[in-house]
């Protein structure tokens, strides 16, 4: 921390300006007035400030603020949001789409994902809803952070809103957003015809039940491997042979460069290696001939 | 060990550019401002301007504003400083030197390069 | 800007002899920097922060001063010890540097 002295009368700041680049750490804490400071934020992020100098600015502004930052501040924080912890941003509140745009600028090139993910948290709470400006500012300056919010905040984005989400924006989604995103672009792509609605709903797909996959391979959609691979391990295992097979179309090759990884590996062993040579593909570990599949979970829950 | 290692000397016409570089190695280069000093013919020194390597922000004495200017190239470690509209007066050695850690002066200093302004 | 006047401006002093120089500000200031610089080759930080010797500086330099007053100090010059002496201070902006003392050795 920096020990508290007094000002020296000839270092007495009346602005934020350049005489302040080579003031010591000790020399900021006691001759800058955290109100000045934060008046004139929009200064500081011209000046060469060192990371020690803005260490002791920060503090300054903590000290002034300590329920959080008002967004007149945050708006101007320029470089001093790469020092601004996921703690200290779960104080803001943000509104403002132009205060978002600033600070993920500033971001760009740094470390800052935590941080960021919990400004566009606070940008959602701000603003109500995951709105069409918001998503359209996130895919804009910040590609794949939609990704960085919570199924619970993904919950609000309305179904009108999809379709400004671009296939890159979903690169970094989970399951968990994905089953919230996916009905709702199931609902905003529903009046588009069979070619055109798989091209949109492809990458949501990650989210899709069994019974959505089934159609789609009753549609001649030549799914290609990496969608596939993404869809959920829960929907693919109970597809069969044949509708894997129309679902894939052409691709259907490409299994046996997958037959390790999941969700394929666990597929082959729930098919019967009859139906899995049908495919020609030399894939093996399905259930040999003969064999009985007992389903032991209905057994249990009868008794 | 800490090196700046800056260009070459420099024969320029007046009225032209030139560009010197300072290239750092043996710290990180986006921790520590880099300044900029010019010393004519023996005499004395003069700070031309300081730039922060993380930011790309500067700040320069009133005198050289308009004369030099300040830019880093963070992928190479690399400090520069263009000088425009030479005369004799710019004649000099030039120094890239770091801002040691709170305030504590220069610390280290790159060898200087020469820029010779004549006809 | 603050104004840096070091004297003398040349001196010259026996092995063994005590030798200081002076710089004076023409406002306070709160810190002065000292680099020695010889011939031929670029400053090195010498004193810093009014009185801490730089790494590598030997015992027998010493800094001390405030306000608009500082000076350096060698307890028993050496022959190394010959070279250009300028203070430094970066208080007030911009920085400047004073016109230096050149120590020669008898």
């Known amino acids: 921390d920096v020990e508290r002295t007094t000002c020296p009368p000839e270092k007495e700041v009346h602005e934020i300006d350049e005489s302040l680049i080579f003031y010591k750490k000790r020399e900021l804490e006691a001759c800058v007035d955290a109100a000045l400071l934060a008046a004139q934020m929009d200064r500081v992020d011209a000046i060469p400030f060192t990371y020690e100098q803005l260490d002791v600015l920060k503090h300054k502004l903590d000290e002034l603020y300590p329920q959080g930052y008002p967004e007149s501040v945050i708006r101007h924080l320029g470089h001093l949001f790469l020092k601004m912890s996921p703690e200290d941003i779960r104080k803001w509140n943000v509104t403002s789409l132009e205060t978002l745009k600033a600070l993920l600028k500033v971001s760009k090139g740094h470390e800052m994902s935590a941080q960021v993910a919990t400004l566009i948290d606070r940008v959602v709470v701000g603003r109500g809803q995951l709105d069409k400006d918001t998503v359209d500012t996130l895919t804009a300056f910040c590609p794949g952070c939609l990704c960085s919010l919570s199924p619970e905040r993904l919950s609000s984005v309305p179904p009108s809103v999809i379709g400004a989400v671009r296939p890159q924006d979903l690169d970094t989604c989970g399951p968990r957003q994905l089953d919230v995103l996916y009905p709702k672009a199931r609902l905003a792509f529903q009046n588009m015809s069979g070619s055109e609605y798989f091209v949109k709903i492809r990458p949501f797909l990650g989210g899709a039940p069994t019974e959505d996959v089934k159609a789609l391979s009753q549609q001649n959609v030549s799914m290609d491997l990496a969608t596939f691979m993404k869809l959920r391990r829960e929907a693919v295992l109970p597809l069969t042979v044949a509708e894997v097979q129309k679902l894939l179309g052409p691709h259907v090759e490409g299994l046996k460069v997958e037959e390790q990884h999941s969700p394929v590996r666990d597929w082959i062993l729930k098919q019967r290696q009859d139906d899995l040579d049908t495919l020609g593909l030399g894939l093996q570990g399905g259930i040999p001939n003969g064999y009985l599949i007992l389903d032991l979970s209905v057994r249990e829950a009868l008794s | 060990e800490f090196q700046l290692q800056q260009s070459g000397p420099e024969l320029v016409k007046p009225g032209a550019s030139v560009k010197i570089s300072c290239k750092t190695s043996?710290?990180?280069?986006?921790?520590?401002?880099m300044n900029w000093v010019k010393q004519s013919n023996g005499k004395s020194l003069e700070w031309i301007g300081v730039?922060?390597?993380?930011?790309?922000?500067?700040g320069y004495n009133q005198k050289f504003k308009g004369k030099a200017t300040l830019t880093v190239d963070q992928s190479s470690s690399t400090a520069y400083m263009q000088l425009n509209s030479l005369t004799s007066e710019d004649s000099a050695v030039y120094y890239c030197?770091?801002?040691?850690?709170?305030?504590?002066?220069?610390?280290?200093w790159g060898h200087g390069t020469s820029v010779t302004v004549s006809s | 800007q603050i104004v840096l006047t070091q004297s003398p401006a040349i001196m010259s002093a026996s092995p063994g002899e005590k030798v200081t120089m002076t710089c004076s500000a023409s406002s306070s200031v709160n810190y002065m920097h000292w680099y020695q610089q010889k011939s031929g080759t670029s400053p090195k930080r010498w004193i810093y922060d009014t009185s801490k010797l730089a790494s590598g500086v030997p015992a027998r330099f010493s800094g001390s001063g405030s306000g608009t007053s500082y000076s350096l100090t060698i307890s028993s010059m050496e022959a190394e010890d010959a070279a250009t002496y300028y203070c430094?201070?970066?208080?007030?902006?911009?920085?400047?540097f004073g016109g230096g003392t050149k120590l020669e050795i008898k």
């Open positions: 043996g710290y990180s280069f986006t921790d520590y401002n």
């Open positions: 730039i922060n390597p993380n930011y790309g922000t500067t």
């Open positions: 030197a770091r801002g040691g850690y709170d305030g504590e002066a220069m610390d280290y």
């Open positions: 430094q201070q970066w208080s007030s902006y911009p920085p400047t």
